[in-house]
């Protein structure tokens, strides 16, 4: 009877397995109804082809335990070859095979595109035993199919170390159009043309595109995907989207805002972080960029002084970081500071102006007429000088710094003394005899230490020598003075 069944393979009207319409019964419901289910034809063995290189789907005939007859080759029966269904529908399909009862421990596994389907898939295998054979039906169901379920599904059965493989069932999931390219938000120049692109795919194809601007359709006739919309230019912000239509329905892209580029808003919150005598470190918060990246910023500085000529200093800087150190400023001066930034369209207005001051500077000149005497009886050195002519910006004089260096036979020692601002003379103890003492004096204000005077040298003899003549600051251009006693 089985042999006859094999010969009956001819009634398969066209080609078994992959032929989409090859089943002997109408199974329109399998493909066209919302809930599809696999159709299983009557139990029948697959025809084998003469001269086939290997068995693959067919298990080799085997002798029964009695040794009396050969068993037929085993093969999966043919089922539907191609299922087309809509996304989110349910589908069920199956494989079936009749296995002689002498075979034990048959297992059926499902594979998709070469990978075994394990775990969270709904596969059920049912066994229908008879006197000689057991009909096995392996069902595979997917609820709410997605595009990722597209693929070629096959059954594999392990039996006596043989692997029997079914013909494939191609599952093709169709659905609403799926966007592969959606319009992107853009910032455009006023009245300048620009393009937007929208692309969507099925299946099913074709996919038609309608463009929507501010909730109104732009094109009366649909365009085939992909579609490029050329907008001749805008004078104000607009929102665009595209609708993709296919036989399954419509998908709407995200809405994208098209902004018109403008000059930036002025920076805000200009603040002072640090002031020195000649520099001010400022920061600011950038204003709105006008839908165009900032290119650079300009720091504007005006001296607030009735006597100044009111000129504005301009310092250009990069737009980021939002910080700038203004240099080359006068000490102890008041300034008004504003910031403006630019993009490709132009400059912003200037930020609100803020007032800032530099601190006192250090004196810019050294004390004058420095003279040095050796007072041998007291064993000290008298130093005298004249107060320097400091500018107002240097601030109030708070004192003087005296540097005296003692050099003798390869030894050098520098000492510093601080004296008050009311003094114009000082005495220092002799540190070393038979040595040279080099003296320099600098004026000191709150702003810092000014330059030191030119060095004045005096020789300190061994005990018993007398020094009557002073050593003094030389006239400009003279070599270091040395008074030899």
């Amino acid at each position: 009877a089985i042999t006859e069944a094999r010969e009956e393979a001819k009634p398969y009207p066209l080609f078994p397995g992959p032929l989409p319409g090859s089943l002997q019964t109408d199974h329109t419901s399998l493909l066209s109804l919302p809930h599809t289910s696999g159709y299983q034809p009557a139990l029948m063995f697959s025809p084998t082809q003469p001269g086939r290189p290997y068995t693959g789907n067919v298990a080799i005939p085997r002798v029964t335990s009695a040794g009396s007859k050969l068993l037929p080759p085993l093969a999966f029966k043919h089922t539907v070859g191609h299922i087309i269904l809509s996304e989110h529908k349910d589908v069920k399909f199956n494989c079936s095979i009749s296995v002689p009862n002498i075979y034990q421990d048959t297992t059926i596994s499902w594979w998709k595109d070469g990978k075994e389907l394990l775990g969270a898939h709904h596969a059920i295998t049912q066994f229908y035993p008879d006197d000689e054979v057991t009909a096995i039906i392996a069902s595979f169901s997917i609820t709410s199919v997605q595009r990722s379920d597209n693929g070629s599904y096959i059954c594999k059965m392990k039996i006596n170390n043989e692997e029997i493989v079914s013909d494939p069932i191609y599952i093709e999931v169709q659905g609403l159009p799926h966007f592969t390219k959606q319009p992107e938000s853009m910032n455009v120049t006023r009245n300048t043309a620009f393009n937007l692109t929208c692309q969507a795919v099925g299946p099913p194809e074709p996919v038609n595109i309608f463009w929507v601007q501010n909730s109104s359709r732009v094109n009366e006739q649909p365009e085939k995907s992909p579609s490029v919309l050329t907008v001749p230019g805008l004078t104000e912000m607009a929102v665009f989207s595209c609708e993709a239509h296919n036989d399954k329905g419509l998908t709407v892209s995200k809405g994208v805002q098209i902004n018109i580029k403008a000059i930036p808003s002025p920076p805000t919150e200009v603040s002072i972080h640090n002031s020195t005598a000649h520099s001010i470190l400022i920061s600011w918060v950038p204003g709105f960029d006008g839908y165009s990246p900032f290119r650079n910023c300009s720091v504007q500085v005006k001296e607030v002084d009735p006597l100044s000529n009111g000129s504005v200093m301009i310092f250009n800087t990069s737009a980021s970081p939002h910080m700038y150190q203004i240099k080359q400023l006068q000490a102890l001066a008041n300034y008004s500071i504003g910031v403006s930034c630019m993009n490709e369209i132009g400059w912003s207005a200037v930020s609100p102006w803020i007032l800032a001051s530099t601190t006192e500077g250090a004196p810019s000149v050294a004390p004058l007429n420095v003279t040095v005497f050796l007072n041998e009886s007291r064993d000290n050195v008298d130093i005298r000088w004249m107060k320097p002519l400091t500018k107002r910006q240097a601030g109030e004089l708070v004192g003087y710094r005296i540097s005296h260096v003692w050099q003798s036979a390869g030894i050098s020692k520098e000492l510093l003394e601080e004296v008050g601002q009311n003094n114009s003379r000082a005495q220092i103890s002799v540190q070393v005899h038979n040595a040279t003492c080099t003296v320099r004096i600098a004026a000191v204000t709150k702003g810092g230490v000014g330059p030191f005077s030119d060095p004045v040298k005096i020789f300190i003899p061994a005990h018993g020598w007398v020094d009557h003549a002073p050593s003094s600051t030389p006239a400009p251009g003279n070599a270091d003075p040395v008074l030899i006693i």
């Epitope: 992959p18 066209s32 693959g56 079914s166 494939p168 191609y170």
Partner: antibody
Framework: QDQLQQSGPELVKPGASVKISCKAS????????IHWVKQRPGQGLEWVGW????????KYNERFKGKATLTADTSSSTAYMQLSSLTSEDSAVYYC???????????WGQGTSVTVSS | DAVMTQTPLSLPVSLGDQASISCRSS???????????LHWYLQKPGQSPQLLIY???NRFSGVLDRFSGSGSGTDFTLKISRVEAEDLGVYFC?????????FGSGTKLEIK
Amino acid sequence: QDQLQQSGPELVKPGASVKISCKASGYSFTSYYIHWVKQRPGQGLEWVGWIFPGNGNTKYNERFKGKATLTADTSSSTAYMQLSSLTSEDSAVYYCARLGLIYALDYWGQGTSVTVSS
Amino acid sequence: DAVMTQTPLSLPVSLGDQASISCRSSQSLENSNGNTYLHWYLQKPGQSPQLLIYRVSNRFSGVLDRFSGSGSGTDFTLKISRVEAEDLGVYFCLQVTHVPFTFGSGTKLEIK
């Protein structure tokens, strides 16, 4: 990228046999049918048959039974077509093609030219 | 066998013109599940056939929207809305509803 790469041109004598190959890449070879198509110079296309590499099942156009034998080697993802008892009528370009999910021959090999000449 | 009759055999067109190719089957290509397995291919000189339209009207990936297919049952049409130089070659229809699969005889699209 799914691809089918066919073997080079063949010049064979009448009465001989030839075996041409089609190597698949970029997809699961054992999951999709491979079809073979014949094209004689300046003529149309003629379907030879298919093989399903997953199990070796084949189907032939009646006109090519006994002429063509389709096989597949899954370890190398290669399908073969052997043509026997060649005559000048068998001189043609032979293509392999995959039957894709959409149930169309979606990817084709570049073709193998077979020339039968003494 | 399902005999596929394709017309015209040769189609001279000017660039930018619309071209229309017909394919008629000797039997209906709609199968019992309601699908029609009629596909269109273009074979450029010296190249393999390439799929343009599958199942009557679906454009294959990467195929430009100038190509469209229509029809049902036994009569099918391929249209090219604005012919470009790269469209020249031989166009074939193929049915895979019935075994053996059968091709149309081909239409050669050429410049006038």
